[in-house]
């Protein structure tokens, strides 16, 4: 059973399909979620949709074997299995591991620490979003790109505002939050 990985954003419509053509003159085609929960079965020229959480929001294309699912949610995370009963009576199967992710919310930047140290401004900022598994990247006048939820930096005396942007992203979306400081060490705006 070949396994394909798919990551999609929640609320979207998804097409689960295989990249190869179906066996010729197959007898039966069934889509399952997990190992043995039937979603839809095509047999003798008819599609039967089973009582499941997908009923009413799935459609099968018997030509290609594609399964269309509308408005996917995180609860739809699963391994989907398409099993085809070939004319010789043996089955062939393909697996698609579907990961549904919510779009990331806009991050909130919090000042964890701010103090004057020898005319310099020491800053510790944290980029916060509720309980998500995401990637963080800080942008601004920084010695190097920081990929962490916390930014620690020291500002030398400066004339203009300095702004720092935190970008949070997962594989389906990204959002930015920005915080600016006026000299010497004053939070200006976000």
């Amino acid at each position: 059973g070949r396994l394909v990985h798919m990551t999609v954003v929640s609320g979207s419509n998804v097409t689960l399909n295989i990249s190869e053509s179906l066996p010729e003159n197959y007898k039966q085609l069934t889509w399952f979620y997990t190992f043995d929960q039937k979603i839809v079965e095509w047999d003798s020229g008819k599609s039967k949709y089973f009582e499941s959480k997908f009923k009413g929001r799935v459609r099968l294309d018997p030509q290609s074997g594609a399964l269309y699912i509308s408005k996917v949610q995180k609860e739809d995370n699963s391994t989907y299995v398409m099993r085809v009963l070939k004319k010789d009576g043996y089955e062939q199967e393909w697996k698609i591991k579907l990961q549904v992710l919510d779009p990331v919310p806009k991050p909130v930047i919090k000042i964890e620490k701010r103090e004057d140290v020898d005319d310099n401004c020491y800053l510790k900022l944290s980029c916060v979003i509720p309980g998500e598994s995401v990637n963080y990247t800080w942008y601004g006048e920084l010695p190097k790109e920081i990929q962490n939820s916390v930014l620690e930096t020291t500002l030398k005396p400066h004339k203009h505002s300095r702004c720092y942007t935190c970008q949070v992203s997962n594989s389906v979306s990204s959002k930015n939050g920005t915080f600016c400081f006026s000299p010497p060490c004053t939070a200006a705006r976000s």
Epitope: G1, T30, F35, D36, Q37, K38, F50, Y90, E91, E93
Partner: antibody, heavy 118, light 108 residues
């Protein structure tokens, strides 16, 4: 009418291993999903492991996940259950059965007894 | 997971009598996907009924299944001596598949 015959049961120490086999005859074995179902002495039935006809996907009960592995060799018409890290509570008669259309279990083998004890 | 509760635990009847076995599910079994098995001492289970009411191959017509939703019944219209055994229900409407704990039909 197909027949299923289990073997490989016996006495094992806690933490030990056993490998059960189920030989199929009278059926085109590769066309069927298969299962292992167990029955502890004097108790009810509990499915243990499932495998698709092609062997491409498997499914295990939480109670055995990470310890038991189901597999099949369609060229030999044989189903296997590799049982590792055995516990006293794995003591049972183990049946293999055809997992008919991924729904019910029919027919069944006669069973093989696995006893886990020190 | 769906929990199946069978009642009574033991049914004491005489040959020729009618046996009524109950299987109750903790939540609705979709499409009435329920099977019944018979198991005699020292033997493997045997499929009797699938889809709540369809008799399996070679099962005598004194065995019948009925019910829907959460309540299912296996009826043996006239008990024959070979019918004294333990009976199990099993649902296949949702994963994981589950069995009831069994009902023993014994000779009174």
């Amino acid at each position: 009418e197909g027949q299923l015959l289990e073997s490989g049961g016996g006495l094992a120490q806690p933490g030990g291993s056993l490998r059960l086999s189920c030989a199929a005859s009278g059926i085109t074995f590769g066309r069927y999903a298969m299962s292992w179902v167990r029955q502890a002495p004097g108790k009810g039935l509990e499915w243990v492991s499932l495998i698709s006809g092609s062997g491409g996907s498997t499914y295990h009960a939480d109670s055995v996940k990470g310890r038991f592995t189901i597999s099949r060799d369609n060229s030999k018409n044989t189903l296997y259950l590799q049982m590792n890290s055995l516990r006293a509570e794995d003591t049972a008669v183990y049946y293999c059965a055809i997992y008919n259309n991924y729904n019910w279990f029919d027919p069944w083998g006669q069973g093989t007894l696995v006893t886990v004890s020190s | 997971e769906i929990v199946l509760t069978q009642s009574p635990g033991t049914l004491s009847l005489s040959p020729g009598e009618r046996a009524t076995l109950s299987c109750r599910a903790s939540q609705s079994v979709s499409s009435n996907y329920l099977a019944w098995y018979q198991q005699k001492p020292g033997q493997a289970p045997r499929l009797l009924i699938y889809d709540a009411s369809s008799r399996a191959t070679d099962i005598p017509d004194r065995f019948s299944g009925s019910g829907s939703g959460t309540d299912f019944t296996l009826t043996i219209s006239r008990l024959e001596p070979e019918d004294f055994a333990v009976y199990y229900c099993q649902q296949y409407g949702s994963s994981p598949r589950t069995f009831g704990q069994g009902t023993k039909v014994e000779i009174k």
